[in-house]
């Protein structure tokens, strides 16, 4: 069964770049029925969509983060990655990767999630 | 500021029926974009609970239901149980933001 796992360096210093990778196992990232996305959740707060990517490389970003975000995909490694530049304490959050259903019958929802990884931005 | 508004908390006695609202606007739910619901148990990742307004993925019991009308949507839980204590989020697409939006989240407490 398909699983997603986030990985990254842990704490990030203020003004630096946060880099995370999501590895997809038990299936292929190159399916035309799915997008792949990043969502974050600051401690004690709600969910915020960061952006998504298609296996062919097409991206869509949250407008409020667009200037700082890059999402890329490596189908050969079954991975997609997030880079968030110039981070501040407000970027401290649990970061989730997720699969986005895009078929006509599955309605563009986040149907599978990774376990999430806490990224703390320190000064 | 989230594009979808939910009540911060909802509570009910065991066995009771509870409903959570999700209010959007003409640029998201009102445009015809589907609404999806997620359950987030403490310390875990969100799990898809309702997709396409009212459809239950495999493994979700039929005591959970969803609906959409106009610019709002609802999630109902029948026969509230201790294991239903969680945060619930609605989600849709917003044309003015050109992206996915989540609700503010609702904490369900079993009294």
């Amino acid at each position: 069964q398909l699983q997603l796992q986030e990985s990254g360096p842990g704490p990030v210093k203020s003004s630096e770049t946060l880099s995370l990778t999501c590895t997809v196992s038990g299936g292929t990232i190159g399916s035309s029925n799915y997008y792949w996305g990043w969502i974050r959740q600051p401690p004690g707060k709600g969910l915020e969509w960061i952006g998504s990517i298609y296996y062919s490389g097409g991206t869509n970003y949250n407008l409020s983060l667009k200037s700082r975000v890059t999402i890329s995909v490596d189908p050969s490694k079954n991975q997609f990655s997030l880079q968030l530049r110039s981070v501040t304490a407000a970027d401290t959050a649990v970061y989730y990767c997720a699969r986005i259903c895009s078929s006509l019958t599955s309605y563009e929802n986040f149907d599978l999630w990774g376990r999430g990884t806490l990224v703390t931005v320190s000064s | 500021q989230s594009a979808l508004t939910q009540p911060p908390s909802v509570s009910g006695a065991p066995g009771q029926r509870v409903t959570i609202s999700c209010t959007g606007s003409s640029s998201n739910i009102g445009t015809g974009y589907d609404v999806h619901w997620y359950q987030q148990l403490p310390g875990t990742a969100p799990k898809l609970l309702i997709c396409g307004n009212s459809n239950r993925p495999s493994g979700v019991p039929d005591r959970i239901s969803g609906s959409k009308s106009g610019t709002s949507a609802s999630l109902a839980i029948t026969g509230l149980q201790a294991e239903d204590e969680a945060d619930y989020y609605c989600q849709s697409y917003d044309s003015s933001l050109s992206g996915y939006v989540f609700g503010t989240g609702t904490k369900v407490t079993v009294l």
Epitope: - | A13, R17, S67, L75
Partner: antibody
Framework: QVQLKESGPDLVAPSQSLSITCTVS????????VHWVRQPPGKGLEWLVV???????TNNSPLKSRLSISKDNSKSQVFLKMNSLQTDDTAMYYC??????????????WGQGTSVTVSS | DIQMTQTTSSLSASLGDRVIISCRAS??????LNWYQQKPDGTVKLLIY????LHSGVPSRFSGSGSGTDYSLTINNLSEQEDIATYFC?????????FGGGTKLEIK
Amino acid sequence: QVQLKESGPDLVAPSQSLSITCTVSGFSLTSYGVHWVRQPPGKGLEWLVVIWSDGSTTNNSPLKSRLSISKDNSKSQVFLKMNSLQTDDTAMYYCARHWGTTVVDAMDYWGQGTSVTVSS
Amino acid sequence: DIQMTQTTSSLSASLGDRVIISCRASQDIRNYLNWYQQKPDGTVKLLIYYTSQLHSGVPSRFSGSGSGTDYSLTINNLSEQEDIATYFCQQYDTLPWTFGGGTKLEIK
């Protein structure tokens, strides 16, 4: 079309167990829950238990220790077992399909019922 | 448990009459109320759900209303064949779901 049919013994001795089967057609047990409701002679309806689409169950608390419900999705059958029967368990036993939306929980289709008499 | 009371256990009416059957809950059930019809042969059918919504295939002569703790089922233009039955209210606000004792409708 949607149909439910109960089958079980007509007569059960006191202190014995009752097993009733509800065989359904026209819908899938993976999508709909099934309730059991009973009606003693000349009396009202009493809700007993429901088995939800995912196999989880909810019981009427006073009867919980005596009731068990299970199902076989592939055979479209739901099973009710009731232990330690007494004469006041004599009743018509119905199974019914659960229909749920955000504003309703109802039993939208019912079987014709099976009559069970507890007597020595 | 929530108690559902149908104070009239039986009532008699003439063909063409308008009949009102009442049901009271022991606490506010927030309109989470259904009505069922049980024919003399034991067949049970859902008539009304969520206080006032007509289930598919049910004649429009049937209607429901109420709020809080007090609810009613109205049958307009009583019809002999179709309407001789016992009518039960049922709450689904809180488990266990409970039924009223029933109101048996007979023709004068």
